[in-house]
Interface confidence: low
């Protein structure tokens, strides 16, 4: 059929929960393209009913919630003017009763579920909740050991949990909590994070070093494509997110219709004492609109921005 | 110039304890990881510890034979560099350097290496 | 651990000879490699760092060249000066690892 296969990592999810999984590939996913999501390989595309349990919810696949018999190989086939790529994702979903048993002896799983606090240190816990427009989440409630956890040293930030001076103690399983609302009905995601201390401090105390870019602006003609790297140093047990914004919105929700402008796949380079992130930006045709604006890349407490601005005029070529 | 002057070797039974210091001068200390380093008479280097900066906390690192018996520290006030090492065994005689790692860290310039060495310290565990 | 293994262990040569010495990890270290004279009774020197930087006041003779798992230490055309024992170290991660040395004697 033409399409290009392209099999991306295992995903282990929980059962009996929502859950759901865009399926971006930048570039391919930046221009004009239709987005169909399979099953194992079925010629029928999975239902884009919002009533269906499972359905197609623009690019992403939702489970409301998922199940057991869930599990599978999800294929979702990008197609363009001139181009067809198959993304393959593996779910495997298993019974998962929190309180009853450790996340810990799960295998292979991803770096969400794992996260780590600096001893000593005023540091954070996430939640990842990767959901579509249409999923309303509410307040993040956080667990640990099964008890909600209150006190001082502890705040709820957005989708944070902010732990200050962080101990030993703080060791152990949590687990956060949203009310998730899509068409009316709630569902509750209940995400488990298993979390272990370091003393290690890191450079500058674990403050990621945004390389490039560095508050700047760049020339760019109207009308052409531009692709900026933002390079990022931090230390190899952080748990900090790296990402562009614009007014303060991940860009690929900023211009989720148009898809012109979009955050490409996370890559890294392994050193000693750290690693070396690239995250670029992708703006496939530079509008009027994009000049003077600050395009910025987060990377954990650290920021940093471009700004495009149009060249000069070249009053030799007159 | 930079200088390690290495301190405190000598012989010491079986099960002993002894201190090494390292005091350093000609440089910043406190910008330097710094690593102890021995040879064994007529054979080869083997590492042994690393004492990161305060920039990087601190951290420690150990090879396996000595983990659990020595200790690294340092004291930036007084530019010197220690090593601690308890039940020594025969194994342990060995000259022990003194070295600075001229790990730099900025963004994409990151060397590492041991690029100044003291002149080494004897320490022989002989009943 | 990562374990460095040089060879040869000890290569007989005359002053003007080309000389290659070289280091294999026994997994990929990128660039991070080291290598490091020492002369009888003296504390080791840094020669070359990151694989091919020469160390400050080490004679252009010297050259390093590698990268993953294969480094190699020449020197173009040797002195007396040069006739010594050669370490490579590893530093691409804990705990830092030393190849066993390899003597340069006078032929």
């Known amino acids: 059929d033409g399409c290009k296969d392209i099999f991306m990592k295992n995903e282990i999810l929980s059962a009996s929960q929502p859950f759901a999984f865009n399926c971006t590939f930048p570039p391919i996913t930046s221009g004009e393209v239709s987005v169909t999501w399979y099953k194992n390989s079925s010629k029928i595309p999975v239902s884009k009913i919002i009533q269906s349990r499972i359905h197609q919810d623009e690019t992403w696949i939702l489970f409301l919630p998922m199940e057991w018999g869930d599990s599978g190989v999800y294929q979702c086939v990008i197609k363009g003017r001139d181009s067809c790529h198959r993304i393959h994702v593996n779910l495997t979903v298993f019974e998962k009763h929190w309180c009853d048993t450790s996340i810990g002896g799960l295998p292979n799983l991803s770096d969400e579920y794992k996260q780590i606090l600096h001893l000593g240190k005023d540091d954070s816990l996430t939640c990842h909740l990767h959901f579509p427009k249409s999923c309303v989440l509410g307040p993040i409630k956080w667990y640990k050991d099964c008890n909600e956890i209150k006190g001082e040293r502890f705040t709820v930030l957005e989708t944070r949990l902010l732990v200050s001076n962080v101990s030993a103690e703080d060791r152990g399983n949590y687990a956060c909590q949203a009310i998730l609302t899509h068409s009316g009905k709630q569902y509750e995601v209940l995400n488990g994070i298993t979390v272990s201390i370091t003393e290690r401090a890191g450079y500058g105390g674990s403050v990621p070093k945004i390389i490039y870019p560095k508050n700047h602006s760049i020339e760019v003609q109207l009308g052409t494509t531009l692709i900026v790297d933002c390079n990022v140093t931090d230390t190899k047990d952080n748990t900090n997110l790296r990402c562009w914004r614009v007014n303060n919105t991940l860009v690929d929700d900023y211009y989720d219709e148009s898809k012109r402008i979009r955050e490409g796949v996370e890559t890294h380079v392994s050193f000693r004492e750290h690693n070396l992130y690239t995250v670029n930006i992708t703006f496939l045709e530079v509008k009027m609109e994009d000049y003077g604006l600050p395009f910025m890349c987060h990377a954990g407490v650290s920021t940093a921005y471009i700004i495009l601005q149009l060249p000069a005029p070249d009053f030799r070529a007159y | 110039e930079v200088q390690l002057v290495e301190s405190g070797g000598g012989l010491v039974k079986p099960g002993g304890s002894l201190r090494l210091s390292c005091a350093a001068s000609?440089?910043?200390?406190?910008?330097?990881?710094m690593h102890w380093v021995r040879q064994a008479p007529g054979k080869g280097l083997e590492w042994v510890a690393l004492?990161?900066?305060?920039?990087?906390?601190?951290?420690?690192y150990y090879s396996a034979p000595v983990k659990g018996r020595f200790t690294i520290s340092r004291d930036d006030s007084k530019s010197t560099l220690y090593l601690q090492m308890n039940s020594l065994k025969t194994e342990d005689t060995a000259v022990y350097y003194c070295v600075r790692d001229m790990t730099i860290y900025d963004g994409y310039y990151v060397d590492y290496a041991l690029d100044y060495w003291g002149q080494g310290t004897l320490v022989t565990v002989s009943s | 651990d990562i374990v460095m293994t040089q060879s040869p262990s000890s290569v007989s040569a005359s002053v003007g000879d080309r000389v290659t010495i070289t280091c294999r990890a026994s997994r990929n270290i990128n660039i991070w490699l080291s290598w490091y004279q020492q002369k009888p009774g003296k504390a080791p020197k840094l020669f070359i760092y990151?694989?091919?930087n020469l160390h400050t006041g080490v004679p252009s003779r010297f050259s390093g060249s590698g990268s993953g798992t294969d480094f190699t230490l020449t020197i173009s055309s040797l002195q007396p000066e040069d006739f010594a024992t050669y370490y490579c170290l590893q530093s691409q991660s804990y705990p830092l690892t030393f190849g066993q040395g390899t003597k340069l004697e006078i032929k």
């Open positions: 990151k694989a091919s």
């Open positions: 004492i990161r900066n305060k920039a990087a906390g601190y951290t420690i």
């Open positions: 000609g440089f910043d200390f406190t910008d330097y990881y």
